[in-house]
Structures are given as structure tokens and as C-alpha cells.
Interface confidence: low
């Protein structure tokens, strides 16, 4: 069966997100991937979206993330825009209203996005074969 267009959009967004670092991609987020053995795929996507929403809600207007130069400001704004798009598409893929995020483990946003990209690429390779 064909891959969901949303999945392709997610991978495209993740590729853009992981291409460049910003002042705040090294901040920590909840690592939902650390112990996700008994978690369904839909729950994983839902929880990933929740983590991203928490991040951009907290840091969208963080002056330390915005930086002190036009380039840093632009990069941070772009990061937030991509995270919002990713959040929206993950919710669509998950099809769940809400999901708990209780893990204590932390990961940098950068590592979180790389891990999510790996998962999405694996899913894409399965549905496209």
C-alpha cells in the first residue's frame, strides 16, 4: 500500500530541521524513545507531538533562543515554524486526542529529532516496499 502523504511531509520537515543547529536545539526535551517497548506506533507519534508542543510553547519567545543577531533570530523562527508543522502532522498521523508523557529521561532536541527521523524513515521504507 502507498505511504501516507503526511508521512512524506513529516520526513521532509525532519530533514529540514536536522540540517542546521540553532541556539536552542541543544536544549533538553523528554525522551519518549528511551522506554517505548509497550507503546503503540500511534501513541509514540502522539507523545512525540506532545513533547514538541511543550518545547515550542516554552521557547518560542525565549530571548536567549532568539539570539542577538538577525541570523540567529531567523533560524529560531524557522525552527519554531518547522516544529509547529511537525506537531500538526504527527497529530494527524496519530489520530489520538491526548497522550501522557511521564518519562524522566531527557534528550537534546537535536537527538530527539534525529531519533524521530530514523523511526519515520523505517516506517516509510516498510510502506513503500
Amino acid at each position: 500500500h502507498k505511504c501516507d502523504i503526511t508521512l512524506q511531509e513529516i520526513i521532509k520537515t525532519l530533514n529540514s530541521l536536522t540540517e542546521q543547529k540553532t541556539l536552542c536545539t541543544e536544549l533538553t526535551v523528554t525522551d519518549i524513545f528511551a522506554a517505548s517497548k509497550n507503546t503503540t506506533e500511534k501513541e509514540t507519534f502522539c507523545r512525540a507531538a506532545t513533547v514538541l508542543r511543550q518545547f515550542y510553547s516554552h521557547h518560542e519567545k525565549d530571548t536567549r533562543c532568539l539570539g542577538a543577531t538577525a541570523q540567529q533570530f531567523h533560524r529560531h523562527k524557522q525552527l519554531i515554524r518547522f516544529l509547529k508543522r511537525l506537531d500538526r502532522n504527527l497529530w494527524g498521523l496519530a489520530g489520538l486526542n491526548s497522550c501522557p508523557v511521564k518519562e524522566a529521561n531527557q534528550s537534546t532536541l537535536e537527538n530527539f529529532l534525529e531519533r524521530l527521523k530514523t523511526i519515520m524513515r523505517e516506517k516509510y521504507s516498510k510502506c513503500s516496499s
Partner: nanobody, 116 residues
Framework: EVQLLESGGGLVQPGGSLRLSCAAS????????MGWVRQAPGKGLEWVSF????????YYADSVKGRFTISRDNSKNTLYLQMNSLRAEDTAVYYC?????????WGQGTLVTVSS
């Protein structure tokens, strides 16, 4: 327990140089971006510089760009700030910070005084 210990501050004349160090312990240093922030007497906090975990990307406030250089040695768990062409307005307490943007851990700070 996370610990950040700054050193290298002191009194220096305008145009002079100083090198600040920050010895980190209690966490996986190489996994985190690190930064320097400062607080001038009677003023608020100002972020100075930031370096990513790998050390490949660095960022500077406009006020120090071209004069300050941030670096790190992950094998020694140490963060550095080389400060050249110092000015009176650089006088401040300089803090080493883990994960700039959230400031989850701080050092005690080291005082840099630029005066003739």
C-alpha cells in the same frame, strides 16, 4: 551533583586579555551545549556566547563578536572563553551555564574588571 566552577577572572587594563575556564562535573559534558552569560554591576543578565556539544558551532552576542572566542575540551570537561581587546563595559561577573536557553545549571561566577 552538577557542578560548574569558573576561574580566570581578575583585573585587567582596557585592551588587555583574559582567558576564563569552567570545569564541569556531575553530568555528561560532551552531550550538552554550553554557554557564558554575564551580569554587569546593577544590570540584568546578558548572554555572551554559546557552543554546541560537538564544538562545531559557536554563537556570540554582537557586543563581543570578533573579540571573544568560546571553545571547549570535551576530554577535560572544560569550557573556555578567550577575551581579547577588553573594554570597560565588559566589566561583569561571568557565569558558565549548561544548556543555554533554559539555564538549568549555573556556576558561581568569576569577576572580570576592566579598568585603568
Amino acid at each position: 551533583e552538577v557542578q560548574l566552577l569558573e576561574s580566570g577572572g581578575g583585573l585587567v587594563q582596557p585592551g588587555g586579555s583574559l582567558r576564563l575556564s569552567c570545569a564541569a562535573s556531575g553530568f555528561t559534558f560532551e552531550a550538552y551545549g554550553m554557554g557564558w552569560v554575564r551580569q554587569a554591576p546593577g544590570k540584568g543578565l546578558e548572554w555572551v556566547s554559546f557552543i554546541t556539544s560537538s564544538g562545531l558551532s559557536t554563537y556570540y552576542a554582537d557586543s563581543v563578536k570578533g573579540r571573544f572566542t568560546i571553545s571547549r575540551d570535551n576530554s577535560k570537561n572544560t569550557l573556555y572563553l578567550q577575551m581579547n581587546s577588553l573594554r570597560a563595559e565588559d566589566t561583569a561577573v561571568y557565569y558558565c551555564a549548561k544548556s543555554l536557553g533554559r539555564f538549568d545549571y549555573w556556576g558561581q561566577g568569576t569577576l572580570v574588571t576592566v579598568s585603568s
